[in-house]
């Protein structure tokens, strides 16, 4: 599947997942905490203040680095999966903290966590996610 299609599919799935998670957690616009979001790279579930959310590296990096081996499982497509099975010490895991001021920036930043190789990816722009 073309990466652009994967992207659109993942974004749509993310919005559905967030909606389901909001219902499960009883989240609404006035709830304290951090709303679920699609950050143009991957999907983040809603979280309570003080909660750290972990995600596996998104499909985007598997396209860039097909030989990259991550020690973590991919979060399930039907829901957000069990992020307890992920560990920040693993390669391929990104975290955000939910604070009183909202989401922190990703840690580590995606390129560091997911093994982005700018030289390996110089070619093949047709497989690049154009996020519009």
């Amino acid at each position: 599947m073309h990466s652009d299609c994967i992207f659109k599919k993942e974004q749509a799935m993310c919005l559905e997942k967030i909606q389901r998670a909001n219902e499960l957690m009883g989240f609404n616009d006035s709830s304290p905490g951090c709303p679920g979001m699609w950050d143009n790279i991957t999907c983040w579930k809603p979280a309570h203040v003080g909660e750290m959310v972990l995600v596996s590296c998104p499909e985007l990096f598997r396209i860039f680095n097909p030989d990259q081996v991550w020690e973590t499982e991919t979060i399930g497509e039907s829901d957000f999966g069990d992020s307890n099975s992920l560990d920040l010490s693993d390669m391929g895991v990104v975290s955000r903290n939910c604070t009183e001021d909202g989401w922190s920036e990703p840690f580590p930043h995606y390129f560091d966590a997911c093994g982005f190789d700018e030289y390996e990816s110089e070619t093949g722009d047709q497989d690049y996610y154009y996020l519009s």
Epitope: N40, T99, E105, H109, Y110, D112, E118, L131
Partner: antibody
Framework: QVQLVESGGGVVQPGRSLRLSCAAS????????MHWVRQAPGKGLEWVAV????????YYARSVKGRFTISRDNSKNTLYLQMNSLRAEDTALFYC?????????????WGQGTLVTVSS | EIVLTQSPATLSLSPGERATLSCRAS??????LHWYQQKPGQAPRLLIK???QSLSGIPARFSGSGSGTDFTLTISSLEPEDFAVYYC?????????FGPGTKVDIK
């Protein structure tokens, strides 16, 4: 090798506008976030703004929010900083820097800077 | 916004001595704290990322430690080319911020 060359600096009167440019080469510009960081004469570094690789996300320091606009043209490998309502305290050497990430990242490569002097 | 405080403002040492620079954040930044070196008339150079991760091309005498709110940059044995200004930078929360810098000068 990564190269960033800033231009557009100069002397401008308070209240006027100026647009800075940063020409990038030696890397796939369209895949990286980009930052502007400034340094007033004899002072420390001040983070100004960042733009995500596709221009979809832009963030600013409080001191410039509403006055400065960061933008990019990936087809020209160029980063911009539109500065309006300039003040004396905006006088600084403005650096563009590559952010090591799609979204924001930390600056890993820097240009040599372009000097902006706001004076009547 | 997160305020970064660096101490001391100036550190006067001789070549061969050990330099210990401190950076303190007003709230936790986890490990998203990076160190830069700037020499007069030059652009800053990234030295250490994520508090303690070394970078290729950076001499092994530079090391970093810390997490949360307290961080340290250590230069194990100062070389003449190490006399410069050092800045910490947090990329944990927007707006990003830099510390005011520590100047390491020759005693």
């Amino acid at each position: 090798q990564v190269q960033l060359v800033e231009s557009g600096g100069g002397v401008v009167q308070p209240g006027r506008s100026l647009r800075l440019s940063c020409a990038a080469s030696g890397f796939t510009f369209s895949r990286f976030a980009m930052h502007w960081v400034r340094q007033a004469p004899g002072k420390g570094l001040e983070w100004v703004a960042v733009i995500s690789y596709d221009g979809g996300n832009k963030y600013y320091a409080r001191s410039v929010k509403g006055r400065f606009t960061i933008s990019r043209d990936n087809s020209k490998n160029t980063l911009y900083l539109q500065m309006n309502s300039l003040r004396a305290e905006d006088t600084a050497l403005f650096y563009c820097a590559r952010g090591y990430d799609f979204l924001t990242g930390y600056p890993d490569y820097w240009g040599q800077g372009t000097l902006v002097t706001v004076s009547s | 916004e997160i305020v970064l405080t660096q101490s001391p403002a100036t550190l006067s040492l001789s070549p061969g001595e050990r330099a210990t620079l401190s950076c303190r954040a007003s709230q936790s930044v986890g490990r998203s704290l990076h160190w830069y070196q700037q020499k007069p008339g030059q652009a800053p150079r990234l030295l250490i990322k994520y508090a303690s991760q070394s970078l290729s091309g950076i001499p092994a005498r530079f090391s970093g430690s810390g997490s949360g709110t307290d961080f340290t940059l250590t230069i194990s044995s100062l070389e003449p080319e190490d006399f410069a200004v050092y800045y910490c930078h947090q990329s944990s929360r927007l707006p990003f911020t830099f510390g005011p810098g520590t100047k390491v000068d020759i005693k």
